[in-house]
């Protein structure tokens, strides 16, 4: 899901910093300092070079741009705005570049941008208009098809006084710009919940990765609108049980494959419907690997092997009969 390049030959630039005053704009085919360029592969790689800003002299032919492993810190408005525009840039990988702030309009003037990877950046401040570029209620549609936001949660002491989930969702929903998004990866972000409106407003999604978060429940999440959804990754969360409404919605999606491994399933009476569903459904991949975590007597039991007699709940005693 990240930009890749062919094995075409790469030309390296001279090893000096591009900070000289220029009387004219860069030649369209020159390679920025500290980068490698292949015009044949339409690829520029500025990788692990401790760059503190996006090079100004990117060649106009660039289709795949790797800016990984740098120290960009802030991605300002128009970070990739050039004259002429980078009209061919389709895949942009900014992973692991110590970004902590992405400002409104950071990706403006990239008309062909299909893939964007911001993974492994501690994004304490992601503008609501980072992807839409406008504070209009309905923005011009973004060309983005894949948005990779794995492990973008900042350390706890660097987070703003607001919900991290809310900040990310605001950026995803602003101006309804991402209506064409097909792949969204949000793995490893310590998400405790999924705001209920997010999926309804991303109707084109084919692939959604929410693995390795801290999701406890999907009760308020609706998958009903995601009729094109093909894969839903929920592995390594804190899910205890999936309730009937969620099961029915997932079953109703025509192309779906769901991944549920490594969740702490609670095998009590509330699990009965899910077990019944698991035995019948084809949508869960590796369903034979799902095991109970609680209660203690059920630990490591395979969900598919349970029957209703196994799934009991301790009776709730009236207050007068409870002991301390």
């Amino acid at each position: 899901s990240s930009p890749t390049s062919s094995a075409s030959s790469f030309s390296s630039s001279a090893p000096f910093l591009a900070s000289a005053v220029s009387a004219q704009p860069p030649l369209p085919d020159q390679c920025p300092a500290l980068c490698e360029c292949s015009e044949a592969a339409r690829t520029v790689k500025c990788v692990n070079r401790n760059l503190t800003e996006v090079p100004t002299d990117l060649p106009a032919y660039v289709r795949n741009l790797f800016l990984t492993g740098n120290q960009l810190a802030v991605l300002p408005a128009g970070a990739f705005a050039r004259r002429p525009p980078l009209a061919e840039l389709a895949a942009l990988n900014l992973s692991g570049s110590r970004l902590d702030e992405v400002r409104a309009g950071a990706f403006e003037h990239l008309p062909s941008l299909r893939q964007l990877d911001l993974s492994h950046n501690p994004l304490a401040d992601l503008s609501p208009f980072a992807f839409s570029g406008s504070n209009a209620s309905v923005s011009a549609p973004s060309p983005l098809v894949e948005l990779i936001l794995n492990h973008i949660v900042p350390p706890e002491d660097e987070r703003q006084n607001r919900s991290f989930e809310g900040m990310v969702v605001a950026a995803l929903l602003a101006g309804r710009a991402l209506q064409g998004l097909r792949r969204l990866e949000l793995a490893s972000n310590h998400f405790l919940y999924l705001p209920r409106d997010v999926l309804a407003q991303l109707p084109s999604l084919r692939h959604l990765d929410l693995s390795n978060n801290s999701l406890v429940s999907l009760t308020y999440v609706s998958f009903r609108n995601l009729t094109h959804l093909e894969s839903l990754h929920l592995e390594d969360n804190a899910l205890k049980v999936l309730h009937n409404g969620t099961l029915a919605e997932l079953q109703g999606l025509p192309h779906i494959r769901v991944f549920l491994d490594n969740n702490p399933w609670v095998c009590d009476c509330h699990m009965a419907d899910m077990v019944t569903w698991l035995k019948e459904t084809e949508v869960v991949q590796g369903k034979d690997r799902l095991t109970c975590a609680y209660p203690e007597k059920m630990r490591n039991r395979v969900l598919l092997e349970l029957n209703s007699a196994d799934l009991d709940c301790d009776p709730i005693l009236p207050p007068s009969l409870q002991t301390s």
Epitope: V21, S22, P25, A77, G78, A81, R83, P85, A87, P143
Partner: antibody, heavy 121, light 111 residues
Framework: EVKLLESGGGLVQPGGSLKLSCAAS????????MTWVRQAPGKGLEWIGE????????NYTPSLKDKFIISRDNAKNTLYLHMSKVRSEDTALYYC??????????????WGQGTTLTVSS | DIVLTQSPASLAVSLGQRATISCRPS??????????IHWYQQKPGQPPKLLIK???NLESGVPARFSGSGSGTDFTLNIHPVEEEDTATYYC?????????FGAGTKLELK
Amino acid sequence: EVKLLESGGGLVQPGGSLKLSCAASGFDFSRYWMTWVRQAPGKGLEWIGEINPDSRTINYTPSLKDKFIISRDNAKNTLYLHMSKVRSEDTALYYCARPDHDYNPYYFNYWGQGTTLTVSS
Amino acid sequence: DIVLTQSPASLAVSLGQRATISCRPSQSVSTSSNSYIHWYQQKPGQPPKLLIKYASNLESGVPARFSGSGSGTDFTLNIHPVEEEDTATYYCQQSWEIPLTFGAGTKLELK
């Protein structure tokens, strides 16, 4: 309120030099690209050049790059245009201008009132 | 450099009628999402005023009787209905590449 105030124009002899200034106020000058545009009497607009916020990138129109130098002093909120070897065809009203966004300019929302340079012997 | 050919050089329009000004760049100045043409109005003794950016986006505070259209190498500024205060010179500008360039201008007068 954004304000741009050009100064330094006047009468100069052919071959002489002059430095125009543009004092900016009402915004964070150090964040914005700034631009010079000129207009000869009764003629159209001509883009002279631009300078980025930290002065690392300066672009000129090709025909003027050998005689004009654009600079800025962010501490003084001032943009400069240093003109040398001026000729009669440099007689014009000189405007400084600013875009509404803080990256390289595509268009100009804010303009000064201009300062007039007259080149004559 | 990109040359912007503006036409007509001048036109006279009756109050309430439509004024149409053309701007033709010497090469395409459009991507799939933006056209890098902008329109300005200049009245005597005043600096230019931005009317329209990116070919068709009306600048804040500009009356809705101004509109822009076009892509590639063919752009149009329309004013309808023309009002007395619209007497001015109109310029197009491209920001596709450096150097930025302006059209020669179109002078609009009232009949």
